[in-house]
Structures are given as C-alpha cells and as structure tokens.
C-alpha cells in the first residue's frame, strides 16, 4: 500500500522494520543493551534514526507505558538550558537533577531525570517508518 509513496511527514504508513515498535506515526526502538549517552546517539544514527525526541506530554505518557524503573537515554541535553537534539527547548515537562554535572537526559516510567552522560543506560531511538524521510 505504501510502496512508492513520498510522504513529507511521518504519516500514513503502518509498517516499522523488525525490532521496531510502531506508535502513532513513528517507529520506536527500546534497547536491550546499555551504552553511554553519546554511544546511544551514535547507535540510533547508525540505524538511520535519532535518539528519542519527545514532542509533547501525550507522546511522553504513552511511551512511559513501555518503560520500567530503569532509566533510558533520550535525545535531551543541558547546553545552557535543556534542549532536545532537534534544537527545541524542553517546555512541556520538568526534569529532576541532583548535580550540575548531570547534563544528559533520561526517562523512566516516572518521568525525566538528568544523569551523568558517561553512565551506561538503555536508550530509545525514534524514526519515521521509511528511512528516506527526515525525522527533523
């Protein structure tokens, strides 16, 4: 049905590759391994995706259903303020932080948490159903 279609956004096509979970108009990958923040980002890029950028509270709430107490890296960093990897500011949720050295963002079922970027954690990647479509 979707072959040959050229969508300008991530809409309409139902399929995600193996190992990816479809929710809404995107595909999500929840890692089985643990890496530091930078290596998690590189993993996602090497699979033609991005470390998870959450667009709104609705997406965050729905993703948290799939999470446990364990934290997962997401595409959120503190560079003079918390920003997503697409450059947008974090403006729909609070993030807990215990120290100024915790400059990378993670998520679990309870919310967002700052962490030292060197800690190995699980991670979440996000992409469009087709690799030739830009996520942002």
């Amino acid at each position: 049905l979707c072959q040959g279609s050229n969508y300008s956004t991530c809409a309409s096509c139902p399929s995600c590759p193996d190992r990816w979970m479809k929710y809404g108009n995107h595909c999500y990958y929840f890692s089985v391994e643990e890496k530091d923040w930078n290596s998690s980002l590189e993993f996602c890029l090497a699979r033609d995706s991005h470390l998870l950028v959450i667009t709104d509270n609705q997406e965050m709430s729905l993703l948290q259903v799939f999470l446990s107490e364990a934290f997962c890296w997401i595409g959120l960093r503190n560079n003079s303020g918390w920003r997503w990897e697409d450059g947008s500011p974090l403006n729909f949720s609070r993030i807990s932080s215990n120290s100024f050295v915790q400059t990378c963002g993670a998520i679990n079922k309870n919310g967002l948490q700052a962490s030292s970027c060197e800690v190995p954690l699980h991670w979440v990647c996000k992409k469009c159903p087709f690799a030739d479509q830009a996520l942002f």
């Epitope: 590759p17 190992r19 391994e33 643990e34 530091d36 890029l45 090497a46 033609d48 800690v119």
Partner: antibody
Amino acid sequence: EVQLVESGGGLVKPGGSLKLSCTASGFTFRNYAMSWVRQTPEKRLEWVATISESGNYNNYPDNVKGRLTISRDNAKNNLYLQMSLLKSEDTAMYYCVRDDWEGRAMDYWGQGTSVTVSS
Amino acid sequence: GIQMTQSPSSLSASLGERVSLTCRASRDIGSSLNWLQQKPDGTIKRLIYATSSLDSGVPKRFSGSRSGTDYSLTISSLESEDFVDYFCLQYASSPWTFGGGTKLEIK
C-alpha cells in the same frame, strides 16, 4: 552463512591512497550498520570507521578523521574504505565487520586485507 | 576513550586445564563487553557478547563473568584448538576499544 570478503590491500607509499572493498553475503546487507577495524603488526586492534544502514551517517575516531572515508553500495552488497594521505602507522590488516544489530559491537568479521605503507 | 587492560598477555597451560583471562575497564561499561578469538590464520570470531552470553556454535566450555569493572573469560577444560589469541572489546562508549590480547600457549 554470513560471509565478508575484503580486497584491495597492498603496498603503498606514504602520502598515497588506497581503496579497500568488502563484499557481503548471507544476510540482508542494507539492514546492518557496518564497520572497519584494523590490526597493527603488534596485534593491537583499533576501530576505524562505521557507516549507517543507508550510508547517510558515518562515524570515525579522531585519529583517522579526514583521511579515511567509509562508504557502501547496498545494491551491490559492498562496503568500501577510501584511504588517503597514508602514514606508516596505517600499516595493518583491515577487517570488514558487521555491527550486531542490537548494539553489541561486531558480530561477524571478514578474513582481512593487508595494507603496508612504506617507502 | 575507555582503556581496556587485558591480562595476562600470554599464558601457558596444559590440555584439560581450566584458565581465566581478565580485562579491566578504566571506567564503568556495564555489561557491554565482548570476547573475541583470533586463529593463527587471522580469522576473528566473537565468542561472547554482553559479558556472559555465548554466541551460537561456541562450545559450553567457554564462559564469561564480571566483577565490577573486571571481566573474565574462563575456559573450563582446554582443548587443542583453544591455544590461540583472545581479545576483549568494550562497546559501552565510543570509540569502541579493545584489550591488548592474550596469547594462550600449550605447555
């Protein structure tokens, strides 16, 4: 059976160039990120490049950035490593490796192709 | 990058003997460690991934374990084909880094 077969190695002068190739079979090549790893004459192993499934993203350690370029042709199941401005310290056996999809580094290795940089 | 210190660099042992090789990471890498085997012809094969999971086809005499930032590969009863080179590889943090290798020799 997963197979990775490298070619293109040889003797090259310092400052010279060389292009290595790797032909993959036994798996769906376009679904895997791929890497090159080298082994020095002293047997030290060193990761030198990774490329994404589609070829849109590359990653290199700092010591080879700008001199080594990884690329791929998914239609031909081929992986490449273009090497330029070669130095004696680039002398090594170069291995084509498949990246474990789940992120557990390299799961299959080729037999290697030897590169010697010497005047 | 993370330094992986592998020991011993060489080890002499007898057929049937139990041996352990160790890699120490310079910082926390969780369970993100592989063990590789290299034959004399240069062929490299992954034996163990994620610290303790055996790759398919790898004999059960091989096992992996972890204590803090120390990682061990144990061969419970050495066979003739085990007398080759072994390397560890961490993949928690880019750049991926390898141990210096252990050459296992027959006594």
